[in-house]
């Protein structure tokens, strides 16, 4: 917030030492000129002393076809050429011409550094003609000025594509001081210096700034603007503003805090988004920053099966998005989770842990000891297989899967059967005859199915043909046996 | 070699507490669940609890909660058992055994007499 | 809690023999079941792991197996040094809990 202290009654030139053509406002007007009822135009006075010889731009008239005789160059009166006022105060200004009648359409335009003031600008043109001249007033008026009204006036005539331009009038708006740069918040490492800049312009010049901290004046003597302010160090939270002064009063800048840096609060709310056999996604809401970027999280993962190793898993991730999916961890297995953020301070705490769980996994090894014959009074294939020693984190057995493959001249056809956990043996019907069959099991828990046993082939002959040998399981190393009758 | 060393004896009064230590060495003190057992002559074994050494997270046999408090002093790899108002029925060998209960110490026969 | 009975209560053998002992479950404990040995005087010792996994430095005469609620211990070929207390212990569930032991002996 921008605090304005009560405008001072005394004048403060803006230049040192006195100023031709240049006197302070809020008097009444000492033109007898024609304006706008309600205004009350800062006094004006003419740049140059009377007598003086004038040396603007003017336009010379060319001969008249009557009398053959030179008319006086044109030139604008000179008028006030520097209005020092206020800010909010009402100022009104004009250039004058007197203009011989032989010249017609003239028009006067204004013009503000160098750019012509068209449109909603209070400029008012009057015509006071007699038999030779027209007396021409163009005014201009700004009601409630502000710092942007500073500036150059000028007022410029065409006429016979000739330009005449008057002398400017320099507008210059006093009043309080005007913050050009402020102090910004700042997030500081506890103990460690750092600056802090206010500027603040007039006019009136000069701006003088002091410095406040927590409602108590640093500097016992102001500084001239602008000012930077080295803090030492702070131990704790502060609010710093600066005061700036000149001869209209004073501007209080916006409050600033400077927060101390500090280790981040723990995350909140880890939830789980998805477990499988060996991963859990999890996210968490971070907690508080500590008024210094996250850069990374740490999510730790606890064993806390009741007879586990209790090992402590530590993965590393980026502080977003907020999420992280943990690898590697065994099936069927209970743990407790954590999330540690970190700053360039340090470590957050470890959020609350929270329970979790994988689900069963797939076995990991086939049914062993797999053998297949062919029992031909029946017209069908005899299999036979031992339990796998599945670990205890595929879970419980549900079943097994047989796939059996039938191949006879080019023609190929898989099979699938399902078994339950009990099982050791199972009877499949011959599909073809005269065609190889491979035979090969998978185990099968609620976490899925497992690898499947090496292949069996057994030969299945035309109808007639005997034979009640069996064909196994190769040992390791072998090729896969096929046993042909 | 992984080691779990404990007082072989403590002699206490009825009524009095007692802390009963386990200094671990040879692996890493903080990555592996602390468990104790008690076991009362010619009895069988009893679960008391289990402190976990990296948090201090503790979970105890529900029969033992108003008996036993587990601690640990992570830059001395010690596990402590504190037993209070000590009674006949505490006499016991108290064990302390990590993880899996692979390791195990080697019991501290704890007397509570007059 | 979950209860683990354990049968034979005692169990007298003459070296050379195989024995098996049983731990009956209350509850499914899904292999989370595991055997120890306690020598006279001493410390117990972990022989199996989750109902058959073994153990680096148990001799591989111990093996365990089972599932849901029935476990068994198998001892091929005892030996004198295997005169003991034999315990099992579910890891399924907090409080953890053992069996009240079966003791081998040796004729």
């Known amino acids: 917030a921008i605090t304005e202290a009560r405008e001072e009654a005394k004048p403060y030139p803006l230049f040192p030492g006195p100023l031709p053509g240049s006197l302070q406002t809020d008097h009444t007007s000492l033109l007898s000129l024609p304006h706008t009822s309600g205004y009350q135009p800062a006094l004006m006075f003419s740049p140059t002393q009377p007598g003086r010889p004038y040396t603007g731009n003017v336009a010379i008239p060319r001969v008249t076809s009557a009398g053959s005789k030179l008319l006086p160059p044109l030139a604008f009166k000179h008028t006030v050429g520097h209005i020092i006022l206020s800010e909010h105060k009402d100022v009104k200004f004009n250039c004058s011409i007197s203009v011989p009648n032989i010249y017609q359409d003239t028009t006067i335009s204004w013009w503000k550094d160098g750019k012509e003031l068209l449109g909603a600008h209070h400029a008012i043109t009057q015509f006071y003609p007699d038999d030779e001249v027209t007396a021409i007033i163009a005014s201009f008026s700004i009601t409630s000025v502000q710092r942007s009204d500073n500036g150059s006036y000028i007022c410029k005539m065409k006429i016979n594509n000739e330009e005449i331009v008057s002398d400017p009038i320099y507008i210059e708006v006093q009043g309080l001081p005007h913050f050009t740069k402020q102090p910004e918040s700042m997030n500081v490492t506890r103990n460690t210096a750092f600056n802090l800049t206010c500027q603040a312009v007039g006019p009136p010049e000069p701006v003088n700034i002091f410095w406040v901290q927590n409602s108590s004046r640093v500097n016992e003597q102001p500084e001239k603007s602008p000012s930077v302010l080295t803090v030492p160090g702070l131990t704790e939270m502060a609010v710093f503003s600066c005061e700036a002064h000149n001869d209209k009063g004073l501007t209080v800048s916006k409050g600033v805090q400077i927060n101390i840096k500090a280790i981040p609060s723990p995350p909140t709310e880890v939830s789980i988004h998805n477990s499988t056999a060996h991963s859990i996604l999890i996210s968490w809401v971070p907690g508080f920053d500590g008024y210094s970027p996250f850069r990374n999280c740490s999510v730790q993962v606890k064993e806390v099966d009741p007879l586990s190793n209790g090992s402590v898993m530590i993965f590393n991730t980026s502080a977003s998005p907020h999420m992280y999916q943990i690898k590697q961890l065994q099936a069927l297995a209970n743990y407790s989770i954590g999330v540690s953020c970190m700053n360039e301070i340090g470590w957050s705490a470890v959020s609350p842990w929270i329970l979790a769980s994988t689900t069963e996994g797939a076995p990991s090894v086939a049914p062993l000891n797999v053998t297949v014959f062919l029992n031909e009074s029946r017209d069908n294939v005899d299999i036979r297989w031992m339990k796998p020693l599945t670990k205890r984190q595929a879970g419980e057995l549900v079943g097994y899967r047989i796939s059996h493959v039938w191949q006879s001249a080019g023609i190929s056809k898989e099979l699938l059967e399902e078994v339950g956990q009990n099982n050791s043996r199972a009877q499949i019907s011959v599909q073809v005859h005269n065609a190889t069959c491979t035979v090969r099991i998978a185990a099968v828990t609620k976490g899925g199915v497992g690898p499947f046993s090496d292949p069996v082939k057994i030969f299945i002959p035309a109808h007639g043909w005997v034979d009640h040998a069996p064909s196994s399981t190769p040992a390791p190393g072998n090729a896969d046996p096929v046993l042909i009758i | 070699q992984v080691q779990l060393q404990q007082p072989g004896a403590e002699l206490v009064k009825p009524g009095a507490s007692v802390k009963v230590s386990c200094k671990a060495s040879?692996?890493?003190?903080?990555?592996?669940?602390m468990h104790w057992m008690k076991q009362r002559p010619g009895q069988g074994l009893e679960w008391i609890g289990r402190?976990?050494?990296?948090?201090?997270?503790?979970n105890y046999n529900e029969k033992f909660t108003d008996k036993a408090t587990l601690t640990v002093d992570k830059s001395s790899s010690t596990a402590y058992m504190q037993l209070s108002s000590l009674t006949s029925e505490d006499s016991a060998v108290y064990y302390c055994?990590?993880?899996?209960?692979?390791?195990w110490g080697q019991g501290t026969t704890l007397t509570a007499s007059s | 809690d979950i209860l683990l009975t354990q049968s034979p209560a005692t169990l007298s053998v003459t070296p050379g023999e195989t024995v098996s002992l049983s731990c009956r479950a209350s509850?499914?404990?899904?292999?989370?079941l595991h055997w120890f040995q306690q020598r006279s005087h001493r410390s117990p010792r972990l022989l199996i792991k989750?109902?058959?996994d073994s153990i680096s430095g148990i001799p591989s005469r111990f093996t365990g197996s089972g599932s849901g609620t029935d476990y068994t211990l198998s001892i091929n070929s005892v030996k004198p040094e295997d005169e003991a207390i034999y315990y099992c212990?579910?890891?399924?569930?907090?409080?953890?809990?053992f069996g009240a032991g079966t003791k081998l002996e040796l004729k």
């Open positions: 055994a990590i993880g899996t209960l692979i390791y």
């Open positions: 040879g692996y890493t003190f903080t990555n592996y669940w």
């Open positions: 402190i976990h050494p990296f948090d201090s997270d503790t």
């Open positions: 509850q499914s404990i899904y292999k989370k």
């Open positions: 989750f109902a058959s």
């Open positions: 212990l579910q890891g399924y569930s907090t409080p953890l809990t």
